[in-house]
Structure formats: structure tokens, C-alpha cells
């Protein structure tokens, strides 16, 4: 068990805050919930802060909960692969650029580590080149969401992980809107983490809707589970 | 789903106690700061009791000091206010509310994510 993974042997408070610029649209968002790694379960809900949400809730996803991959569960037999808690308490840099095909793109950098028995992940988002009547900016998507494998593999160079996935959007009138992820994760501290061989995230994602709340909001119900890479060969003679 | 529910306000005289509690589901209730806010009609929302969620230190407002006294009860998942002494200033709706931020003692209500509906207090 790396030092990391210690902090996540039972619940842990989660807290997110976004500050988020899209087209200059400018909003902030505050999450808070539980995450519990032992199921690879997180619960959330978010608040847009300053009045309505200026893009559509399922785009942001990946960049709140696809954030505290350290909440992944990981099987016993991969959990020399877990970045993501090895470089816990002191955290990690995640970065992405998002491109919604057809569309404009996203930039993200967040940083995703323990204030005290908190887990915080705070991200800086901007958005550019969207349609004002897009599927984006139109808010033309449904308020639902697919499940997803997310690509990860190590790089050494950085000290940490690329990861890389594509997510479909449903869209109203039955098409999809793709938005292809390109992530990076790098150790905010300088102590020794677990460069994993290559293997995914497997995650499935349900969006709902507090029906006492007045502010726009989202509640988020997440399970993710690590897979890709089988038992050793040891394993199967036991 | 999370649900906060209040209950046991109602219409008291100047000087009675009464004790409200806040009824969490749907949420790991030790995790979180606990706090009262309550309202008076056409006023702001005003910080009445908080409670960490660690070692249980309690923080009240001046206005109801050495009167109300703030509890939690972690294993049943709810938060109480007792209200000795009322007033008829006290006349307001008292809300809960759950955070995990560290500066919960100086959140305004809208800030807090998870909150209830409301009880209402009148004191005549």
C-alpha cells in the first residue's frame, strides 16, 4: 500500500470549486460531497454560484469528478498502478484540453489534493471558439450520461500519467456530440509515486436533480472501477 | 439524495424552550460542519449556532449566547438546537445546513451547498 493510498481506507469529504470562462461567459461553481474508494464511489452536488450556468451541466463532468480519480477503486492485484492515490496527500496537477468536435474546446488545470481530511480539487477553466447556438453554448444536450473507459499510461519523463478518452454527449435529437480529452497529470510534491503500466478507468456516471433546489445545480452519483490489466502469472497458480 | 428536514418549531411564549432538530439522510453526517441559520421576515439570513465536525467546538452568535445550545447526535444523524429563554426577536424560520469548508463560520447561507427547508419559530 503506497503512503497515498492510506488516506482512502474509509469516506472522504470531497469539496470542488471551479472558476470557469467560456466565450467570456464567465462562472464559478461549488461542489461538495463524500468519495469512498473502496467502492469507487463518489457523490456529489454542485451549485452554480453565480446564477445560471452558462453550458450545458454533462460537459462538465469529466472536470469534477473525472477529477478525483483517486476515488477509482483499484482491484487488489493493480494497486501498484494507482497514480493517482500514491501522490496523495500533497496531490496532483491535472490538466486537460477538451475538444468538442465541431465545436470549440475547453482548457483545464486543476489542482486535486487533501486540505486537512479534505479532498479539494480546484480548477481554472476557459473556454473558446464556441457557437453561440452550438450544442454547447444552445444548451442543446440532454441531462443524462454515458458510460466511459478512460485510457491511462504512465509518463516517465513528467513523473506522471497521459490519460485519453473521448466522450459522447447525447444530444436532443438523438445524435452525439464527442468531446476528446487529452489529460495530464504531474506530482505536486516531490516524493515517490506509482508510474502504472497501461490499463483504463471504467466509469459509469448518473446526473439527477434536488427537487427542494431553487439555485441551478447538479447532483452527481459516480462509480469507477480500474480494469486492463490481469493477474500475474503467480496469481493464476495459486 | 441528500435530505436535511427540520423539525419542532412552532408558537411559544416570551421566556418557554424549545428544541428544534435537523434530520440528514443520504449523507456521511460526521463528515461535515453543522450549522443553524434562521430568518426573520423581509432579513437577512442570520448565523445562529455552528458545530465542527471534529472534537464538536461550538460557535453561536452573540444574539442567542448562554440561551441556545447547539448538539450533534452522529450516530442517529442529527443535528439539534436548544432554545432556552425565547424572545419574541427569535421569531424566524431556522434553517440547517452541512459543509466541509474550513471557513464554514463565515459562510453566508447561500454559500452552503446542502441546506433545508426550514422550520418556523414564533414567539409571542
Known amino acids: 500500500m503506497s503512503k497515498g493510498e492510506e488516506l482512502f481506507t474509509g469516506v472522504v469529504p470531497i469539496l470542488v470549486e471551479l472558476d470557469g470562462d467560456v466565450n467570456g461567459h464567465k462562472f464559478s461553481v461549488s461542489g461538495e460531497g463524500e468519495g469512498d474508494a473502496t467502492y469507487g464511489k463518489l457523490t456529489l452536488k454542485f451549485i452554480c454560484t453565480t446564477g445560471k450556468l452558462p453550458v450545458p451541466w454533462p460537459t462538465l463532468v469529466t472536470t469534477f469528478s473525472y477529477g478525483v480519480q483517486c476515488f477509482s477503486r483499484y482491484p487488489d492485484h493493480m494497486k501498484q498502478h494507482d497514480f493517482f492515490k500514491s501522490a496523495m496527500p500533497e496531490g496532483y496537477v491535472q490538466e486537460r484540453t477538451i475538444f468538442f468536435k465541431d465545436d470549440g474546446n475547453y482548457k483545464t488545470r486543476a489542482e486535486v489534493k487533501f486540505e486537512g481530511d479534505t479532498l479539494v480539487n480546484r480548477i481554472e477553466l476557459k473556454g473558446i471558439d464556441f457557437k453561440e447556438d452550438g450544442n454547447i453554448l444552445g444548451h442543446k444536450l440532454e441531462y443524462n450520461y454515458n458510460s466511459h473507459n478512460v485510457y491511462i499510461m504512465a509518463d516517465k519523463q513528467k513523473n506522471g500519467i497521459k490519460v485519453n478518452f473521448k466522450i459522447r454527449h447525447n444530444i436532443e435529437d438523438g445524435s452525439v456530440q464527442l468531446a476528446d480529452h487529452y489529460q495530464q497529470n504531474t506530482p505536486i510534491g516531490d516524493g515517490p509515486v506509482l508510474l502504472p503500466d497501461n490499463h483504463y478507468l471504467s466509469t459509469q456516471s448518473a446526473l439527477s436533480k434536488d427537487p427542494n433546489e431553487k439555485r441551478d445545480h447538479m447532483v452527481l452519483l459516480e462509480f469507477v472501477t480500474a480494469a486492463g490489466i490481469t493477474h500475474g502469472m503467480d496469481e493464476l497458480y495459486k | 439524495q441528500v435530505q436535511l428536514v427540520e423539525s419542532g418549531g412552532g408558537l411559544v411564549q416570551a421566556g418557554a424552550s424549545m428544541r428544534l432538530s435537523c434530520a440528514a439522510s443520504?449523507?456521511?453526517?460526521?463528515?461535515?460542519?453543522w450549522v443553524w441559520f434562521r430568518q426573520a421576515a423581509g432579513r437577512e439570513h442570520e448565523f445562529v449556532a455552528g458545530i465542527i465536525r471534529s472534537g464538536g467546538e461550538t460557535l453561536s452568535a452573540d444574539s442567542v449566547k448562554d440561551r441556545f445550545i447547539i448538539s450533534r447526535d452522529d450516530a442517529k444523524n442529527t443535528l439539534y438546537l436548544q432554545m432556552n429563554m425565547l424572545q419574541p426577536e427569535d421569531t424566524a424560520t431556522y434553517y440547517c445546513?452541512?459543509?466541509?469548508?474550513?471557513?464554514?463560520?463565515?459562510?453566508?447561507?447561500?454559500?452552503?451547498?446542502?441546506r433545508g427547508q426550514g422550520t418556523q419559530v414564533t414567539v409571542s
Open positions: 443520504g449523507i456521511t453526517f460526521s463528515l461535515y460542519h
Open positions: 445546513a452541512a459543509t466541509h469548508r474550513a471557513d464554514w463560520y463565515s459562510s453566508a447561507f447561500r454559500e452552503y451547498i446542502f
